[in-house]
């Protein structure tokens, strides 16, 4: 019972964390303008992996999409393939795990094939979890170098008479959700990990003796135990998981020029 | 056709209060950031406050603040401006006006005449 | 705050004529976000409220006839008519809407020789 608990749970975070991960990747709120020096802009910046935004307070937002490959940060590079990676290896241990859930029956799938399955599942989502952590902690650490580059840009470009408001970034929500959603497939993987021990069938199976006494012939042959889990190996659990979860999409819709009442 | 109609100016005496409405058609009121402008005796335009689309913040000159509060009755599709503690320098044509493209407002009432005098 | 001085204050002109006015900020209006400066330029005839003529420093409001043209860029800005007709008598004014308190200028008058 506790392994499939284990499993199950292991799996359910996974799912929460890697569906983290895809909402963190397609945010626009990476790096998100810093208002300690201008707190009463009526033009808010904000960027994520793949475009930037601008926020006026008339309602109006503009936002322009990285077209360009060549012309952008090597580092920025480098948190879109991290978090793709972690989206792919997240997607394939998802499903590999689906598979190898005790609660679901495949055919004739054996206990020792399900535990692979649950361990090849389990280090996918560390993979996952680990992809994600690197890739929001690379662009953090991005913004905070920045950060401190533009501040100093600030105090040792003052002597002119024209002030020039410099922009600053600083963190989005979108880190935040990265490194919990993350964290959260990393325990999940580690869970599956776990589970996978308890799934997997420790084969003791001594070898046969005979002995032959006064005419009569007994052959004991043990079976193979199994590691105790709370259920005979004839007794199946079946449960039926109705996804109840829906995803919508809030469009936000803009004001036109002509928006009739 | 959008459509902004001031109403509430009045004459008032100096430490008094007054309610300036802004009733909006032709566009939902809500998705616009509102401002107040107003226009001086001497024809000096000056902001006096802004409330952003959604109604989150409101912004106000440093003249009016702690004295003036910015509102939206959404359903009613209407601006508010709520002046208190009035000074003779508030003394002004009211406007309101619907912020566009750039923060510029693209859509301006006729006005409502504030005159504060003992 | 952002200190919005506009010259000349007054300007006097024949029809036909190429007018140019200007509008100085004491901090650059240029949003590093989109690369847009935040500058509008108004309108305002005797009795009417002010009219949105340019908004982003040089963008067009619909309906404004192409004579009007808004340049410049951070801190200098400029307005120019190429040929002024007698319904631009008016005055003009600038604003500041990057950063509250959105300023506006004294205003240029536009007059009639």
């Known amino acids: 019972m506790a392994v499939t608990a284990c499993q199950g749970l292991g799996f359910v975070v996974s799912l929460i964390g890697i569906a983290g991960i895809i909402a963190a990747t397609c945010m626009d709120q990476w790096s998100t303008q810093d208002l300690y020096n201008n707190p009463v802009t009526a033009v808010f910046n904000y960027q994520g992996l793949w475009r930037s935004c601008v926020r006026e307070s008339s309602g109006f937002t503009e936002c322009r999409g990285y077209f360009t490959l060549l012309g952008l940060p090597a580092m920025l590079q480098a948190v879109r393939a991290l978090m793709i990676v972690g989206i792919v290896l997240g997607a394939i241990g998802l499903l590999v795990s689906i598979f190898a859930l005790k609660c679901i029956r495949i055919g004739s799938m054996e206990d020792s094939a399900k535990a692979n399955m649950t361990l090849t599942s389990g280090i996918m989502f560390i993979v996952s979890g680990l992809c994600a952590i690197a890739g929001v902690s690379v662009f953090a650490n991005m913004l905070v170098t920045n950060f401190w580059m533009s501040t100093a840009n600030m105090y040792t470009g003052m002597g002119g008479m024209v002030q020039t408001v410099q922009t600053r970034y600083t963190f989005g929500a979108a880190l935040f959700v990265g490194w919990v959603a993350g964290g959260l497939t990393l325990i999940g993987g580690v869970m599956m990990c776990i589970a996978c021990r308890g799934l997997a069938p420790e084969e003791t199976n001594y070898k046969a003796v005979s002995y032959h006494a006064s005419g009569h012939s007994v052959a004991y042959k043990p079976g193979g135990f199994k590691a105790s889990t709370g259920f005979g190996s004839n007794t199946k659990n079946k449960k039926t998981y109705d996804g109840g979860a829906h995803t919508e999409d809030e469009l936000q819709s803009y004001p036109s020029k002509h928006d009739y009442v | 056709e959008v459509q902004l109609v001031e109403s509430g100016g009045d004459l008032v005496q100096p430490g008094g209060s007054l309610k300036l409405s802004c009733a909006a058609s032709g566009f939902t009121l809500s998705r616009y950031g509102m401002s107040w402008v107003r226009q001086t005796p001497d024809k000096r335009l000056e902001w006096v406050s802004t409330?952003?689309?959604?109604?989150?913040?409101?912004y106000y000159s440093d003249s009016v603040k702690g004295r003036f509060s910015i509102s939206r009755d959404n359903a009613r599709n209407t601006l508010y401006l709520q002046m208190s503690s009035l000074k003779s320098e508030d003394t002004a044509m009211y406007y309101c006006?619907?912020?566009?493209?750039?923060?510029?407002?693209?859509?301006w009432g006729q006005g409502t005449a504030v005159t504060v005098s003992s | 705050d952002i200190v919005m001085t506009q010259s000349p204050s007054s300007l006097t002109v024949t029809a036909g004529e190429k007018v140019t006015m200007s509008c100085k900020s004491s901090?650059?209006?240029?949003?590093?976000?989109?690369?847009?400066?935040?500058l509008t330029w108004y309108q305002q005839k005797p009795g009417q409220p002010p009219k949105l003529l340019i908004y982003?420093?040089?963008t067009r409001e619909s309906g404004v006839p192409d004579r009007f043209t808004g340049s410049g860029s951070g801190t200098h800005f400029t307005l120019t008519i190429s040929s002024v007709q007698a319904e631009d008598l008016a005055v003009y004014y600038c604003q500041n809407d990057y950063s509250y308190p959105l300023t506006f200028g004294a205003g240029t008058k536009l007059e009639l020789k």
């Open positions: 409330i952003i689309s959604g109604g989150i913040n409101t």
């Open positions: 982003w420093a040089s």
């Open positions: 006006g619907r912020l566009y493209y750039g923060n510029a407002m693209d859509y």
């Open positions: 901090q650059s209006l240029l949003n590093s976000g989109n690369q847009k400066n935040y």
